[in-house]
């Protein structure tokens, strides 16, 4: 997260760290007791490493009573996701067992009504992604509030030049932005999960390259079918 600040500890009990061989790779969001939603491209970066999900964490390195690392029973990328595009960039991870719920571990309601969030709405994005252009990684969860950007502006040639489909949404990126390592994490508007950070190799913090988020409401049928 660029231009953000440290989150209040455990105030986002849905927040997950998708890890490979014990290292944070991507963000994720607990959407059901046994399921974490993330970004499909995160799996590509995992190669053949052991994928696990950390729940109940604030610090990645310090011991915390609520922290627990779960093995992944099943990884389900969206069937239409492709390595060379950010389309359908969603991944569902089934935990090896149901998560132990509590004040620091709790699923987040996700948007099912397929309607665009009003441009200008302030939404919260959180993650353990880099906090500087130099690539500094935080130990503790960071977050930032970002205004939603209308799709026409996001589709301008100097922004994303027509690449933003109706299944995506954009948020402003003027110094405050999601960045590398935040992919798969949640964009939360009014207490509801609206978007998942896409995992392209986008430049961060440049206002002409807004953040791109996969709209979960657009994938309600797929999410329901996998969770069923």
């Amino acid at each position: 997260i660029l231009g953000g600040r440290e989150a209040e500890a455990h105030a986002r009990p849905y927040m997950a760290s998708v890890q490979v061989n014990g290292e944070h790779l991507c963000g994720g969001v607990l959407v059901a007791e046994q399921w974490v939603l993330s970004a499909a491209h995160c799996l590509e970066d995992a190669a053949d490493g052991k994928v696990q999900v950390l729940l109940g964490a604030h610090s990645l390195s310090q011991p915390e009573p609520s922290k627990r690392l779960y093995d992944v029973l099943r990884a389900v990328p969206h069937p239409d996701s492709r390595p060379d595009t950010i389309d359908h960039d969603l991944l569902l991870l089934q935990l090896s067992e149901k998560a132990t719920l509590g004040p620091a571990v709790r699923p987040l309601p996700w948007q099912r009504v397929d309607r665009d969030v009003e441009p200008g709405t302030l939404c919260d994005v959180a993650g353990w992604g880099i906090v500087s252009h130099a690539g500094r990684r935080p130990d503790r969860l960071q977050h930032v509030l970002l205004p939603v950007l209308d799709r026409a502006t996001c589709n301008r040639r100097t922004h994303h030049d027509g690449a933003i489909t109706q299944r995506m949404m954009c948020a402003e990126s003027n110094r405050r932005d999601s960045c590398k390592g935040d992919s798969g994490g949640p964009l939360v508007c009014g207490g509801v999960l609206e978007g998942v950070v896409t995992s392209g190799s986008r430049v961060c913090g440049n206002r002409k390259k807004p953040g791109i988020y996969t709209r979960v409401a657009s994938y309600a049928a797929w999410i329901d079918s996998v969770l069923a």
Partner: antibody, heavy 116, light 112 residues
Framework: EVQLQQSGPELVKPGASVKISCKAS????????TNWMRQRHGESLEWIGD????????SYNQKFRVKATLTVDKSSGTAYMGLRSLTSEDSAVYYC?????????WGQGTLVTVSA | DVLMTQTPLSLPVSLGDQASISCRSS???????????LEWYLQKPGQSPNLLIY???NRFSGVPDRFSGSGSGTDFTLKISRVEAEDLGVYYC?????????FGGGTTLEIK
């Protein structure tokens, strides 16, 4: 299939005004800016301005700021360009284009002829 | 405004020949976001322009690979490796990095 269908040719008298339309189909109108261009006979293209169909926000080439007014009707997915105080210098083909990717999609053009 | 100067004005070629069109901008057209919004369009007689190349060297979908774009800063080139009859028309370079966006004066590709 993305299409931009423009209104038909106009023959107008000097000093009059005209309003030409550009109806979008095959995509969500509000997801892309609409731009307008002018091309006089045998000449190159000039950018007139653009409009964000969500907000109605416009940007104009200084050269056309007094001449052109861009509007949209979101409900019908149509962009409009009004041209006022027309002179023979305004006789040209006017194009609407969708921005994104680049100017990949163009209307067929509307010929405006200003003649007494 | 950024002035886009194309040369030559007219380019007579034989079918199968290579054609090269030059475009020079009056100032650098590198955008503040780091990208260069230099595009090439082909306008056939009586038709609307068609996008060929965007961001200097990227072919738009469906554009044959005989078209290639290159250049940087202020100097750009469009090359057609083997001219076909359907390639005839007026070619325009365009910059979208600065407001107002501007087109070059055009280069007419014609049969020798």
């Amino acid at each position: 299939e993305v299409q931009l269908q423009q209104s038909g040719p106009e023959l107008v008298k000097p000093g009059a005004s005209v309003k030409i339309s550009c109806k979008a189909s095959g995509y969500t109108f509000t997801d892309y800016y609409t731009n307008w261009m002018r091309q006089r006979h045998g000449e190159s293209l000039e950018w007139i301005g653009d409009i964000n169909p969500n907000t109605g926000d416009t940007s104009y080439n200084q050269k056309f700021r007094v001449k052109a007014t861009l509007t949209v009707d979101k409900s019908s997915g149509t962009a409009y360009m009004g041209l006022r105080s027309l002179t023979s210098e305004d006789s040209a083909v006017y194009y609407c284009t969708r921005e994104g990717p680049s100017f990949a999609y163009w209307g067929q053009g509307t010929l405006v002829t200003v003649s007494a | 405004d950024v002035l886009m100067t194309q040369t030559p004005l007219s380019l007579p070629v034989s079918l199968g020949d290579q054609a090269s069109i030059s475009c020079r901008s009056s100032q650098t057209i590198v955008h503040s976001n780091g990208d260069t919004y230099l595009e090439w369009y082909l306008q056939k007689p009586g038709q609307s322009p068609n996008l060929l190349i965007y961001k200097v060297s990227n072919r738009f979908s469906g554009v044959p690979d005989r078209f290639s774009g290159s250049g940087s800063g202020t100097d750009f080139t469009l090359k057609i490796s083997r001219v076909e009859a359907e390639d005839l028309g007026v070619y325009y370079c365009f910059q979208g990095s600065h407001v107002p966006p501007t087109f070059g004066g055009g280069t007419t590709l014609e049969i020798k």
